[in-house]
Interface confidence: low
């Protein structure tokens, strides 16, 4: 292995190097946690996966799927290979020194490859009230239904929150009024009504499609993942950047949080999920248009997302 990496380092790898790929920029306060999901190709299901920290010397492994390393209490990084092309990493009780660049890597048939890069910024500890708000998500994590909702980024200016909530409320009232009007109109016509509820999907600007990040104040590994946790669904293919790396540790090794394994579908594009505060969802009900009284229901479409993070 060491010889292989040395040869790769000397000869260089084909394709894009680690310098070429833009990292996903994430922000989380001290003491909070992030949950990252990276997608890998199904042919790499048996390959070793690693979560590492990028340093000048190379990519320092923090936790690997290779072995169940029984570290003493105090470990803060947890990795689980959920199978089906899904790798999950949780970093808990984040400290200021955790700021830096990280990556999901897989040592697959084509050698070591970066699945995704994350640039983690650690914010000063939040105020007590704010921490409690975020803490309300602590017992939850996420699941990824076809339609999903998205909250504010924690890094957004707090001053913009009332404006956004106002806009959400206004849109919600408007939608409710339209729906109510449509229902009344249908009832007057005496037609049968078929309905279908959908969560609105939306995008967060300035984010690179990548991994799922669930940001909570809890300091334990994620457990059951309900539908009501806000998250962002981003659709773009994962980048497989070839790289070589060496080991330099900064963190304790990891245990493995138990999560339901996803079905063996083709690998999905990585996603990003940053959660900060409880979010109230608006459910949009579409009246059915079928004459036969059936329910006609198309998925809520996401707007196209061509934004890339500004460096």
């Amino acid at each position: 292995m060491g010889l292989t990496l040395l040869l790769l380092l000397l000869l260089g790898l084909e394709g894009q190097g680690i310098v070429g790929s833009l990292p996903e920029v994430l922000q989380a306060p001290v003491g909070s946690s992030i949950l990252v999901q990276c997608h890998y190709r199904l042919q790499d299901v048996k390959a070793q996966k690693v979560w590492c920290r990028f340093l000048p010397e190379g990519c320092q492994p923090l936790v690997s799927s290779a072995v169940d390393r029984r570290a003493p209490a105090g470990r803060r990084t947890f990795l689980t290979d959920l199978g089906g092309g899904l790798l999950q990493v949780e970093m808990v009780t984040l400290q200021e020194e955790d700021a830096g660049e990280y990556g999901c890597m897989v040592d697959g048939a084509r050698g070591p490859q970066i699945l995704h890069r994350v640039s983690l910024n650690i914010l000063p500890p939040e105020e007590e009230e704010e921490t409690h708000k975020i803490g309300s998500l602590a017992e939850n994590a996420f699941s990824d239904p076809a339609g999903s909702a998205n909250p504010l980024e924690p890094s957004q200016d707090e001053k913009s929150i009332p404006l956004i909530w106002g806009a959400v409320l206004l849109v919600g009232l408007l939608v409710a009024a339209v729906v109510l009007f449509a229902v009344m109109a249908k009832r007057k016509q005496g037609n049968r009504l078929g309905v279908c509820g959908r969560f609105l999907s939306s995008r967060v600007s300035g984010m690179n499609p990548s991994s799922v990040v669930h940001h909570v104040s809890d300091s334990g590994p994620a457990a059951e993942l309900p539908l009501d946790v806000p998250h962002i669904r981003l659709d773009s293919p994962p980048s497989f950047d070839n790289t070589t790396y060496t080991s330099l540790p900064l963190d304790s090794p990891s245990g493995k949080p138990s999560l339901p394994a996803p079905s063996s579908l083709p690998p999905l594009p990585p996603k990003v999920l940053v959660c900060s505060k409880p979010v109230t969802y608006a459910t949009v009900i579409f009246p059915g248009g079928n004459k036969g009284g059936g329910t006609s229901c198309g998925p809520a479409q996401n707007p196209p997302n061509n934004q890339t993070p500004s460096s």
Partner: nanobody
Amino acid sequence: QVQLVESGGGLVQAGGSLTLSCAASGSTSGINVMAWYRQAPGKQRELVANKARGGLPKYADFAKGRFTISRDNTKNTISLQMNSLKPEDTAVYYCNALLDWRLGDYWGQGTQVTVSS
């Protein structure tokens, strides 16, 4: 598997010195980085210092200028010379060996260091 055994912990007066040692045995050929971590009561474990094979030592801010890490690759040992000890240095000090990531990393049982004022 790799076994790590720490020694050298104990009680010392503030301002005093102590040297911790860690000996690795077992499958030591793949050890890349050896490190010292510490965990004070009620606190998170933190890196004190580490040294990669052929690399320069890395120190936590609190250890710079006071602690010195040295590694003997042939004997698979690592030591931590701690000078000008402070009461806040009181903690359990753990030895850590990080192998090539295919093999994992390993921890010693820890050695208690108590600095009295």
